[in-house]
């Protein structure tokens, strides 16, 4: 007997062919001998089966001796042996309907687990293989699990169900809810305006939730909440904000925060959390602020940085177009009795300048000018 695999919710066409290429008497029955559909001359007739409103045929094929049974919106329980009776012959087709669904939701937070469950008819013994968008293969039986979802797991998962040497393919779109970057560093000179951006790695029709930015300043003993906000249908509204610093927040996505000026006391690291409606868990993004200050006090030219810098970063002081006078893997460098001219303070990583501050040193009889 012929085996046909179908997908839950899909449409399947079971074929039945007569030797005569013309419209003749036919009918389809299920394994309980209940009539599904057939013809009375050129007219379609339907029997009392549970498929009644989902069973169909195609009139134009009858003249060619083809009498298909089309079943729409397939259900697992439609799995059965279907019999086509035509020309005193019986053609049997075994239909097996499978369904593959993701646990609870297809929108999952980064780090959560994805479970795919296969619905299959009694008596079947299918195998399932799924391929993630990043090419990772997982195999299993009735359930497949992937723990610790990553951002690269977002996209279309292709799952193949194998039964009786036949296969049926499912495509499931998974959205991993996360920020585009897990962490970011902003380098600023003292007094400059600071822009923090928290772009999301996904798009959804409606986005509702609430968030908060906690900040641990390098100079402070404990962290404090700088701002709390609500998100409703992609519109941002601030609930509470500290007086110092007085952050400003954009009203639309992506989440955008502005610190009026970078000051050494603000240097440090923050953690933005976003709790989404109907989701357990939160999205996190770390943000770091490094602040640079260059000063001249009497005969001492000093350059300092505050905030989370890596030990391999180099801090240098150099006179413009000259070799560095001082260069150290430290957070402060200085030059005593600096020559007059434009001095540059540079924070660099493997030769790449991350932050630069210029200070003009005047001849000793005048006071310094900071451009």
């Amino acid at each position: 007997k012929k085996v046909v695999l179908g997908k839950k919710g899909d449409t399947v066409e079971l074929t039945c062919t007569a030797s005569q290429k013309k419209s003749i008497q036919f009918h389809w029955k299920n394994s309980n001998q209940i009539k599904i559909l057939g013809n009375q001359g050129s007219f379609l007739t339907k029997g009392p089966s549970k498929l009644n409103d989902r069973a169909d045929s195609r009139r134009s094929l009858w003249d060619q001796g083809n009498f298909p049974l089309i079943i729409k919106n397939l259900k697992i329980e439609d799995s059965d042996t279907y019999i086509c009776e035509v020309e005193d012959q019986k053609e049997e087709v075994q239909l097996l309907v499978f369904g593959l669904t993701a646990n609870s939701d297809t929108h999952l937070l980064q780090g959560q687990s994805l479970t795919l469950t296969l619905e299959s008819p009694p008596g079947s013994s299918p195998s399932v293989q799924c391929r993630s968008p990043r090419g990772k293969n997982i195999q299993g039986g009735k359930t497949l699990s992937v723990s610790q979802l990553e951002l690269q797991d977002s996209g279309t998962w292709t799952c193949t169900v194998l039964q009786n040497q036949k296969k049926v393919e499912f495509k499931i779109d998974i959205v991993v809810l996360a920020f585009q970057k897990a962490s970011s560093i902003v380098y600023k000179k003292e007094g400059e305006q600071v822009e923090f951006s928290f772009p999301l790695a996904f798009t959804v029709e409606k986005l509702t939730g609430s968030g908060e930015l906690w900040w641990q300043a390098e100079r402070a003993s404990s962290s404090k909440s700088w701002i709390t906000f609500d998100l409703k249908n992609k519109e941002v509204s601030v609930k509470r904000v500290t007086q110092d610093p007085k952050l400003q927040m954009g009203k639309k996505l992506p989440l955008h925060l502005t610190l009026p000026q970078a000051l050494p006391q603000y240097a440090g690291s923050g953690n933005l959390t976003l709790a989404l409606e109907a989701k357990t868990g939160k999205l996190h993004q770390e943000v770091n602020l490094v602040v640079m200050r260059a000063t001249q006090l009497q005969k001492n030219l000093t350059c300092e940085v505050w905030g989370p810098t890596s030990p391999k970063l180099m801090l240098s002081l150099k006179l413009e177009n000259k070799e560095a006078k001082v260069s150290k893997r430290e957070k402060a460098v200085w030059v005593l009795n600096p020559e007059a001219g434009m001095w540059q303070c540079l924070l660099s990583d493997s030769g790449q300048v991350l932050l630069e501050s210029n200070i003009k040193v005047l001849p000793t009889w005048s006071t310094p000018v900071q451009p």
Epitope: K22, Q40, G41, S42, F43, R58, S60, D63
Partner: antibody, heavy 117, light 107 residues
Framework: QVQLVQSGAEVKKPGASVKVSCKAS????????VHWVRQAPGQGLEWMGW????????GYAQRFQGRVTMTRDTSTSTVYMELSSLRSEDTAVYYC??????????WGQGTLVTVSS | DIQMTQSPSSLSASVGDRVTITCRAS??????LNWYQQKPGKAPKLLIY???TLQSGVPSRFSGSGSGTDFTLTISSLQPEDFATYYC?????????FGQGTKVEIK
Amino acid sequence: QVQLVQSGAEVKKPGASVKVSCKASGYTFSDHHVHWVRQAPGQGLEWMGWMNPDSGNTGYAQRFQGRVTMTRDTSTSTVYMELSSLRSEDTAVYYCARDSTSGVDYWGQGTLVTVSS
Amino acid sequence: DIQMTQSPSSLSASVGDRVTITCRASQSISDFLNWYQQKPGKAPKLLIYAASTLQSGVPSRFSGSGSGTDFTLTISSLQPEDFATYYCQQSYSSPYTFGQGTKVEIK
């Protein structure tokens, strides 16, 4: 050639019954279903039911169920349609028509049934 | 019951015109649709079955299209003998209902 010849016009009183005949010729009578369709004066077509002359099986439109009976006489290749409990709105031309593999391809000439008190 | 709705209910056209009549089913009927032509005092005549198959002997200026719920009968170049009333009928589910008809008249 294929022909369906129907009985003549009838005038009936409300509550009475009418029996219209349809004699088939020019084809194998048992091979084709026969449908009955009526048309009230100045109105559209209304499907009433079908009969399989081979098995005698019938299928009627729900609105005529209990009032219509379709029978056949294989010896004379004739199909009959009887409509009972006649009312004035049953005044119409009644057609028999042969169903083939393509569709309802041959029609009788029609029988006018007038219901009037 | 499946309702069949034809439009327009009547139209005026001239010889040589292209005429289109539509028929809409209240639910999907796949391609189980027939078109008939009826002239005054005569029995209907089958033109098209299975939505688009021309009945033997019917001129090729008649054509049908559609599937599901929306169907069309087209007469590519109207001839004097085509002035009549046209009916669609679904052969999908009992009762096998007809449309209310479209009368094609001479302009």
